[in-house]
Interface confidence: low
């Protein structure tokens, strides 16, 4: 077969070829940051020709044009300077009202180097209608100038731009615009990551609730759904495995739908996710009505053996099938609970549509929708019950009109997307889902994007202050109680001085919080085995401290997951029935257990916590220490087993006021608190006014560093005789 | 933590069927987490994977082994056991149990070394 | 069936860097996995999904996947990690395992 030639060269970019210079290869060109290429593509014709897709003349020299945004076309009650055709990259547009006038949005909006807007469309309303004034997007047309009940707004784009969001909205009863903001756009634009995972995300959280069936209350969280023990969701996952799509942008859509899955499963909800690639036709790799959908083990088995050349004999884009796919496994579960039932009908179904190309065989989408719709009764009650997600990959050949009309229509909400590569692709299925944001008490979630702040990846420590010394930390467990150590407190019991520091989004410094009561518990004594040459003994170093108020989960305050409770249980995903055993069996697995601390300047540090024969060997280094045990014959003396044990090898070491602060280890996208550091051999910040600085210690240090925290599966009684009322346990 | 022990003849006889059982403590064998596996290492060779089993027992074998090779859970005893008929000398090898979590090998048994006598 | 071709020794002088590679047709649309086996011990899980890292496997450990050939370096060679490594795919719902490398540490 004729090659097609290389000749294709773009000034100012690069390009890749998806299948070599072979007929059916896709040329993709791509330019810097705030340059477009033009055309986009190139595909090898059988003639050994290239085709410019959508061209109608001849073969032009490929270049990188300048991106630009669109100008406003129109702007009610009001004025916007400068007044330009279109904005280059890094221009500004800025927004005045008249007299009379309130400007909501943003007053000033600068160009970004992938040609949208940031910031909010500016309106300048007076407040008079039912809804409030919908806006005119830049680059946008607007019909229609009454705000009433029932009434009907209409937009168009101007020029070339690409219309997406709803181009008809209807002012509701609520006084809330139906479907979503119009955007106009330029054809080659895409979304950033960064702009998609939390639009995504939002959308997402708010059908999946991740609410925690413990609760005994629900507050509401947007159009957030309760998906409870009853409520299922269904998941398909539709991969775009036609012939414009690389083998290598494959392995990512793969990646990145393994990430969503995994995601998925950590919510607290019951989830079936179904798996179909798609070229020319469909192939089904996991169906909702197979059990081991809902096993996700199971469901990333089968994305992980999806394989790129099953569909090598028919390479086209053929949407339609993919989606009547997912209707007819629709159709099937209907027929198999009954239409008539609640287990059918308080399914909620999420289609996420993964492709980097247009359809361009098998007929509409849009009809595979539509039946879909049908199918599952969606009207304005149960608008809920559907979220389509179509989220284009690659600049080349998506096509904006497809994709926004397959995408659901929700206010404050967007379902449809373009980024520019799987890469970014993958950036957004690792961020998007942040349950973080909710409001209920949820245990055991940290925000685990690259940008959050320390705070946010551990909401749940605290920080204890006494009126003199030396500080502790702790960690939240509900909304009113914090575990810390118990030596915290042994200079006497008045704690009406002492302070508890808690995260909060408001301030950096977080919001403090007064004691109402102390519970230390009555084993511990540090003078307990003095008489036995054994200065100081830190048996039973716990307590619980019961704030005076109760905290407002946030971002930045949240408890942590404590094992053998019914909330830690639905946290691992456990069966009902599971036991406290069978926890420790799960969190403490390995001879050496990853694990986590937080350092007094608020990072994360790294232990392993040593189990079985290697604790032995972790704790026999006590038998060293001379100064402080001078006649120890029994390490055992000392570190009974109520103690974990870590400080070898690359492990950091706390330093001395990071103690009543966490152990923890992470399960599931989730956070659970298995110790809490209690006392060491070797203080790393000895001598350091500075909190970022720790001296490890020498390779030479006689005793090496050793750390011990309290093992809360050793503490389980004295936990649930104070917390009984608090959480939930589960039987030993 | 999960710990994996083979168990089984250290020989058996050419043609007959080796029989392993491979009992796994430190977490339920049915957790949908998991998933279970046998691979062999033939004297001074490599690794050769044998087969795996899932929860649900959805099973995989190497093709290799043209149907020889039967993979079971017994979730009750908490183990999981591989059947190989018709053996022949070149099945000797040492014979690791492994448990995987996503697609990957992370807990092995210590192995077990099968002889196939004639 | 799918082949994954490995050296069959690589030597590396203490303190120095070791690569070993395994080789497989378009093996970059493949997620890599990397095992360590001491001599008569179990194999243990050194690198997954090409270049992630098992909690516990230090640093020095890393892993890269390219075209037709996947990467296990190890930085810094210590003799502890004289053993034999094999590279491991999934292919078409089978596991395949490379040939294995022994590396000597000089």
């Known amino acids: 077969a004729p090659s097609c030639p290389q000749n294709v060269n773009i000034s100012g970019g690069t390009f890749t070829l998806s299948h070599g210079w072979a007929p059916g290869s896709l040329l993709t060109y791509s330019c810097p940051q705030g340059l477009y290429p033009s055309p986009a593509s190139r595909l090898c014709k059988s003639s050994g020709q290239w085709q410019t897709p959508g061209a109608t003349r001849s073969l032009s020299k490929a270049v990188c044009k300048p991106v630009r945004c669109p100008a406003p076309v129109s702007f009610e009650n009001g004025i916007y300077t400068p007044r330009l055709g279109s904005y280059p990259v890094g221009g500004n547009v800025s927004f005045e009202c008249e007299d009379g006038f309130i400007l909501r949005g943003s007053p000033v909006r600068q160009c970004r180097p992938n040609g949208m807007w940031d910031g909010e469309t500016a309106v300048c309303d007076n407040g008079a209608g039912h809804c409030p004034n919908p806006g005119i997007s830049l680059g946008a047309v607007r019909t229609g100038f009454r705000f009433g009940h029932g009434d009907k707004v209409r937009y168009r784009c101007s020029s070339n731009l690409v219309l997406t969001g709803s181009s008809e909205r209807e002012c509701q009863g609520n006084g809330v615009w139906s479907g979503t903001e119009p955007i106009c756009r330029q054809p080659y634009s895409y979304d950033f990551p960064e702009d998609v995972a939390p639009a995504l995300g939002t959308s997402f959280s708010h059908m999946l609730g991740a609410t925690n069936p413990t609760q005994k209350t629900k507050e509401s969280l947007g159009r957030k759904i309760q998906i409870q023990r009853s409520g299922h969701l269904n998941l398909y996952l539709l991969l775009d495995c036609s012939q414009s799509v690389s083998e290598n942008d494959f392995l990512i859509f793969k990646e990145s739908a393994s990430l969503m899955v995994d995601r998925i499963f950590s919510f607290e909800i019951n989830v079936s996710v179904a798996i179909i690639t798609f070229a020319s036709e469909p192939k089904v790799l996991m169906s909702v009505l197979n059990d081991n959908s809902r096993d996700m083990t199971e469901v990333i088995s089968s994305l992980e053996n999806a394989n790129y050349k099953d569909h090598e004999n028919g390479t086209g884009t053929n949407t339609y099938a993919a989606l009547n796919s997912v209707y007819l496994m629709m159709n099937n579960q209907m027929r198999l609970l009954g239409m008539e039932t609640m287990a059918w009908q308080e399914i909620r179904h999420a289609i996420i549509l993964l492709t980097d190309g247009k359809s361009n065989m098998g007929g509409s989408p849009k009809t595979a929708v539509d039946h879909i719709r049908e199918i599952l009764n969606i009207n304005q009650k149960r608008n809920d019950y559907l979220d389509i997600y179509a989220i284009g990959v690659g600049k080349l050949d998506v096509d904006w009109r497809e994709l926004n009309e397959l995408g659901s229509k929700k206010d404050g909400e967007r379902h449809a997307f373009i980024l520019q590569d799987t890469k970014a692709l993958h950036q957004v299925f690792e961020h998007m889902l942040d349950v973080s944001k909710l409001t209920d008490t949820i245990c055991g979630v940290g925000n685990m994007s690259a940008n959050a702040s320390d705070q946010e990846r551990t909401p749940w420590h605290v920080t204890i202050k006494p009126k003199s010394q030396e500080t502790c930390r702790g960690a939240l467990i509900s909304d009113q109680w914090v575990l810390t150590a118990a030596h915290c407190f042994r200079d006497g019991n008045d704690h009406s001085l002492w302070r508890v520091n808690v995260g909060d989004p408001k301030s950096q410094w977080g919001k403090e919080f007064l004691i109402e009561k102390a519970v230390i518990s009555p084993g511990f004594d540090v003078f307990a085995k003095k008489n036995q040459g054994i200065l100081e003994f830190y048996g039973d170093d716990i307590a619980l401290l019961k704030l005076a108020q109760k905290v407002k989960m946030s971002t930045h305050a949240r408890p942590i997951c404590l094992p053998c409770t019914m909330e830690a249980n639905l946290a691992l995903r456990r069966p009902q029935g599971s036991t406290c055993r069978d926890h420790e069996n799960e969190l403490l697995n390995k001879q050496s257990v990853p694990a986590h601390f937080v350092a007094l300047n608020g990072s994360k540090l790294n232990i392993n916590l040593k189990m079985g024969v290697e604790w032995t060997s972790c704790a026999e280094v006590v038998s060293q220490e001379k100064t402080m045990f001078p006649n120890l014959t029994d390490v055992r003396e000392v570190v009974t087993d109520q103690f974990l044990c870590s400080g070898t090898q690359e492990d950091e070491s706390p330093c001395k006021g990071e103690s009543g602060g966490a152990v923890f280890l992470e399960r599931r996208f989730r956070f659970f608190q298995v110790g809490l550091v209690s006392w060491g051999l070797y203080n790393p910040c000895l001598g350091s006014a500075d909190k970022n600085s720790r001296k490890r210690a020498p390779r030479s240090k006689v005793p090496p560093p050793r750390d011990f925290h309290i093992n809360l599966f050793r503490m389980q009684p004295w936990l649930r005789q104070h917390l009984g009322d608090v959480l939930n346990f589960l039987p030993l | 933590q999960l710990q994996l022990q083979e168990s089984g003849p250290g020989l058996v006889k050419s043609s007959e069927t080796l029989s392993l059982t491979c009992t796994v403590s430190?977490?339920?064998?049915?957790?949908?987490?998991?998933?279970w596996g046998w691979i062999r290492q033939p004297p001074g060779k490599g690794l050769e994977w044998i087969g795996t089993i899932y929860y649900s027992g959805r099973t995989y074998y190497n093709p290799s082994l043209k149907s020889r090779g039967t993979i079971s859970v017994g979730t009750s005893k908490n183990q999981f056991s591989l059947k190989l008929s018709s053996v022949t000398a070149a099945d000797t090898a040492v014979f690791y149990c492994a448990g995987g979590v996503g697609v990957t090998w992370d807990y092995w048994g210590q192995g077990t070394l099968v002889t196939v006598s004639s | 069936s799918y082949d994954l071709s490995q050296p069959l020794s690589v030597s590396v002088a203490l303190g120095q860097t070791a690569r070993i590679t395994c080789g497989g047709n378009?093996?970059?649309?493949?997620?890599v996995h990397w095992y360590q086996q001491r001599p008569g011990q179990a194999p243990v899980l050194v690198i997954y999904?090409?270049?992630n890292r098992p909690s516990g496997i230090p640093e020095r450990f890393s892993g890269s996947n390219s075209g037709n050939t996947a990467t296990l370096t190890i930085s810094r060679g210590q003799g502890g990690d004289e053993a034999d490594y094999y590279c491991q795919v999934w292919d078409s719902s089978t596991v395949i395992f490379g040939g294995g490398t022994k590396l000597t540490v000089l």
């Open positions: 378009d093996i970059e649309s493949k997620n």
């Open positions: 999904r090409n270049s």
């Open positions: 430190g977490g339920p064998i049915s957790s949908s987490s998991y998933y």
